[in-house]
Amino acid sequence: TSSASSSSSSAPFLASAASAQPPLPDQCPALCECSEAARTVKCVNRNLTEVPTDLPLYVRNLFLTGNQLAVLPAGAFARRPPLAELAALNLSGSRLDEVRGGAFEHLPSLRQLDLSHNPLAYLSPFAFSGSNASISAPSPLVELILNHIVPPDDKRQNRSFEGMVAAALVAGRALQGLHLLELASNHFLYLPRDVLAQLPSLRYLDLSNNSLVSLTYVSFRNLTHLESLHLEDNALKVLHNGTLAELQGLPHVRVFLDNNPWVCDCHMADMVTWLKQTGVVQGKDRLTCAFPEKMRNRVLLELNSADLDCDPILPPSLQTS
């Protein structure tokens, strides 16, 4: 790869060549490595505090990982002429704590964006839509990777983190063309209502390693193209009939439910019945009960209705303290 620090001499066929400089400037930013043939620029682990201004126009793949960018302002990648070919942008692990509205404007070919492993205390509602219009121009994004973007507790804003992320995903209906969304490892307690309704093209949704307790208020009905739904490593206790019916109604979906603390009581009966007949759940034979204690490690597929009871709730007059 070429870099700003590399040098090469002038053409070998001129015996009188006096200059040791290359005939054309390198067009690779300082602290970066560039490959014209791969159309790739890598500025990785260089403690950059801002996006290089002199990015080459040919860049399709830009890696800005492992830096110290802190803030991504509006128009952070806007150039004249624009970076018209930039298709994949990886900003993971660059200590971003603020992504402002319009940060990714003027990138007409941007299909994949990775903001993972940045403690985003502030994600503007207009980070991806670029404007505050009720319906904005469609974003070209097809893949949006937002794994582990939750900030530490002391850096959180007053509003819910889930709400902040949801607002950015639905603003202006800009992400209607999104096929892949990764939201793993974000301590989500819930998925805000109506988010998925605004993402009708989703094929892959990763919500693994969060703290989701219930999907009761989440609707998957619109996600007719969904192929993979990752819900592993959450805090799910049971899936209720409405959710089961919606998942069963999706024509291509595969659902991943491993490592959830399933509560195997009377409320689990419908889910067990569904699991036994569905082809939707991958690795369904690995799903085991976590509660109550007497059911711990029992395989869900091996349960029958007699196993799934609820302790009777005593009338108040008979309860003792």
Epitope: A11, P23, L24, E36, A37
Partner: antibody
């Protein structure tokens, strides 16, 4: 020091084929496009095509499709061009040249391989 | 394809004289993708002016380039004997890259 070292001159009969080489050194071969250019005696330069050694993509000038075949051997940082069904019109000097897509300009040229087609 | 026509085909100048050669394209070219090369007898071409007006490394300051759209020019403010060469223009507005027919500069 960037160098593009080409194979020696050839004299061939009409209808024959010839394969010439261009060995690159002094830079990362896989990171830059390699073009080929023809210069006929007393005539201008004609762009034959370009090879992307990273992706394997080849783009030919329509005029040279079926006449020229571009290949590379990444392990030896060498580009090749084969010319087929040669006629006297194909006589000339053929140069490999590194194409900089930052500008779509050529920054380094080989010394050229002279091809003479004669019966 | 975008055809480039250079004029004059041959020009002769005295040392110290100012000379200008032109290159016209059949369709518009981005200024960043228009270039000039110098080729001396028996040698390979060298990129001489890139992106319309920028001098390549080692090119004397008496050379300059200008133009936009379909009309471009190369000027030598004060010709010297070492400038004897053929100058080719080249453009990219999508493949194929094309070259002009060349302007041969001679010294009187």
């Amino acid at each position: 020091e960037v160098q593009l070292q080409q194979s020696g001159p050839v004299l061939v009969k009409p209808g024959a084929s010839v394969k010439m080489s261009c060995e690159a050194s002094g830079y990362s071969f896989i990171d830059y496009y390699m073009s080929w250019v023809k210069q006929s005696r007393g005539r201008s330069l004609e762009w034959i095509g370009v090879f992307n050694p990273y992706s394997g993509e080849i783009i030919y000038n329509q005029k040279f499709k079926g006449k020229a075949t571009l290949t590379v051997d990444k392990s030896s940082s060498t580009a090749y061009m084969e010319l087929s069904s040669l006629t006297s019109e194909d006589s000339g000097v053929y140069s490999c040249a590194r194409l900089r897509i930052s500008y779509y300009a050529i920054d380094y040229w080989g010394q050229g391989t002279s091809v003479a087609v004669s019966s | 394809e975008n055809v480039l026509t250079q004029s004059p085909a041959i020009m002769s100048a005295s040392p110290g004289e100012k000379v200008t050669m032109t290159c016209r394209a059949t369709s518009s070219v981005s200024s960043g993708h228009f270039h000039w090369y110098q080729q001396k007898s028996g040698a390979s071409p060298k990129v001489w002016i890139y992106s319309t007006s920028n001098l390549a490394s080692g090119v004397p300051a008496r050379f300059s380039g200008s133009g936009s759209g379909t009309s471009f020019s190369l000027t030598i403010s004060s010709v010297e004997a070492e400038d004897v060469a053929t100058y080719f223009c080249q453009q990219y507005s999508g493949y194929p890259l094309t070259f002009g027919g060349g302007t041969k500069l001679e010294i009187k």
